[in-house]
Interface confidence: medium
Amino acid sequence: MRTEAQVPALQPPEPGLEGAMGHRTLVLPWVLLTLCVTAGTPEVWVQVRMEATELSSFTIRCGFLGSGSISLVTVSWGGPNGAGGTTLAVLHPERGIRQWAPARQARWETQSSISLILEGSGASSPCANTTFCCKFASFPEGSWEACGSLPPSSDPGLSAPPTPAPILRADLAGILGVSGVLLFGCVYLLHLLRRHKHRPAPRLQPSRTSPQAPRARAWAPSQASQAALHVPYATINTSCRPATLDTAHPHGGPSWWASLPTHAAHRPQGPAAWASTPIPARGSFVSVENGLYAQAGERPPHTGPGLTLFPDPRGPRAMEGPLGVR
């Protein structure tokens, strides 16, 4: 789940030794802490967009924010596959792409994201309230799935209202070399915390009670990003009416790499690759969910009719595995 995490606002320090600089050094650790924590959890984002040119044509884009080797992506609609969902496409980096009507074109956009265009006519064409789900298999993080649908009252060509606040994107940060920054930041954070050890701990207060207090925002991954390590997932169900947020029991687990000293996702791709990937809009994705995802015995064949072979755009399993890599 991508929840918008409000980094707790700190009480302004009492006048004296700290002053303005002290205030900044107190806020900085919380921002760094948020980055250090949020960068370590794999997650999936889903973006659904109705094309302006063809009102019944949809583009679904999905991405995986993790550092493992992605080896399989399935896109389904009507819910998770096996829980009423129907497979639209299966993308395998080495063995090809397979798609079923009304899917028109499935393709890899980057080494960690895919897009799927759906035909817009006939009985099988999607309604604006259709839920689309993407599931990624990654070694060593495991299977991760998210679902999304078109935001309510979206204008054609728009995926969701633009996000109103500056966002610290874990994925973009990773692409831009956040690994080094985070390592430095985490070390600096420890240094700051040690420096402040002899001072009384700053009092935390919810940011909503102090609108004047500085706030930092970050996209917080679903698991392992909060202190409790378990956050309920949210399903955004637009169903052609204002979105509702349903919270269910927490599940899902920490990733294989959550315990590493540096949490940054390694994404060996150039600016051109990530620049073409728009920021997933807030209303268009939901949590990593656990459930019945694939029909029993419905594993796609490795070869056969309908299989479009293509060269691996990422190189031979290009993404770096985070643990025990020799």
Epitope: S69, S71, L72, G82, H92, E94, R95, A137, F139, P140, E141, G142, S143, W144, Q223, L229, H230, P250, H251, G252, G253, P254, S255, W256, W257, A258, S259, V288, N290, G291, L292, Y293, A294, R299, P300, H302, P316, R317, E320, G321, L323, G324, V325, R326
Partner: antibody, heavy 120, light 106 residues
Framework: EVMLVESGGDLVKPGGSLKLSCAAS????????MSWVRQTPEKRLEWVAT????????YYLDILKGRFTISRDNAKNTLYLQMSSLRSEDTALYYC?????????????WGQGTSVTVSS | QIVLTQSPAIMSASPGEKVTMTCSAS?????IYWYQQKPGSSPRLLIY???NLASGVPVRFSGSGSGTSYSLTISRMEAEDAATYYC?????????FGAGTKLELK
């Protein structure tokens, strides 16, 4: 038909070394992650190590890192496990297994196992 | 590491009987995999991603669960189902297995 055949198991003294092999056939070996899993005399299963299809990424059980090395030769369709500084607790039946990514990396095929006994 | 606790350790069932065994994780995991091992044989994949039947597995087997609690059910026990069943997770490092549930024919 997918087949995995392990070999190389033996009786070795503590501190000794051993290299296990797993000959694969019936599938495109280089496309699959492969693992070694061992089964103790008490019948407990313990994951040992995993290697990516291209051999460029390896993953180990922490307590074995440094002593065990997983490798593969895709030209020979063979998976290896080099074990050194062997201890009595390494005594087990060692299986090689294939990770099927269409089954979300479950280990869908296992070999028959090769027995390693570490004893003085 | 995540510890998977299987219960019961040993159970017996008569042919035609419904059998349910559980796998409890020490902390939340995304999915559970189930393997069947008969004496003298290597493990065989039964269920992947909690609820999906592996190729060739009879439909009498089913899996369910989420978070820390998972189960494997055999709707109607058959003689050939007598075996040890292991659950496995790999949402968290390292990949771990449960100690197994031995299912005997009554």
């Amino acid at each position: 038909e997918v087949m995995l055949v392990e070999s190389g198991g033996d009786l070795v003294k503590p501190g000794g070394s051993l290299k296990l092999s797993c000959a694969a056939s019936g599938f495109t070996f280089s496309s699959y992650f492969m693992s070694w899993v061992r089964q103790t005399p008490e019948k407990r299963l313990e994951w040992v190590a995993t290697i990516s299809g291209g051999g460029d990424k390896t993953y180990y059980l922490d307590i074995l890192k440094g002593r065990f090395t997983i490798s593969r030769d895709n030209a020979k369709n063979t998976l290896y496990l080099q074990m050194s500084s062997l201890r009595s607790e390494d005594t087990a039946l060692y299986y090689c297994a294939r990770h099927e990514d269409y089954a979300w990396y479950a280990m869908d095929y296992w070999g028959q196992g090769t027995s390693v006994t570490v004893s003085s | 590491q995540i510890v998977l606790t299987q219960s019961p350790a040993i159970m017996s069932a008569s042919p035609g009987e419904k059998v349910t065994m559980t796998c409890s994780a020490s902390s939340s995991v995304n999915y559970i995999y189930w393997y069947q091992q008969k004496p003298g044989s290597s493990p065989r994949l039964l269920i992947y991603d909690t609820s999906n039947l592996a190729s060739g597995v009879p439909v009498r087997f089913s899996g369910s669960g989420s978070g820390t609690s998972y189960s494997l059910t055999i709707s109607r026990m058959e003689a050939e189902d007598a075996a040890t069943y292991y659950c496995q997770q790999w949402s968290s490092y390292p990949l771990t297995f449960g100690a197994g549930t031995k299912l005997e024919l009554k």
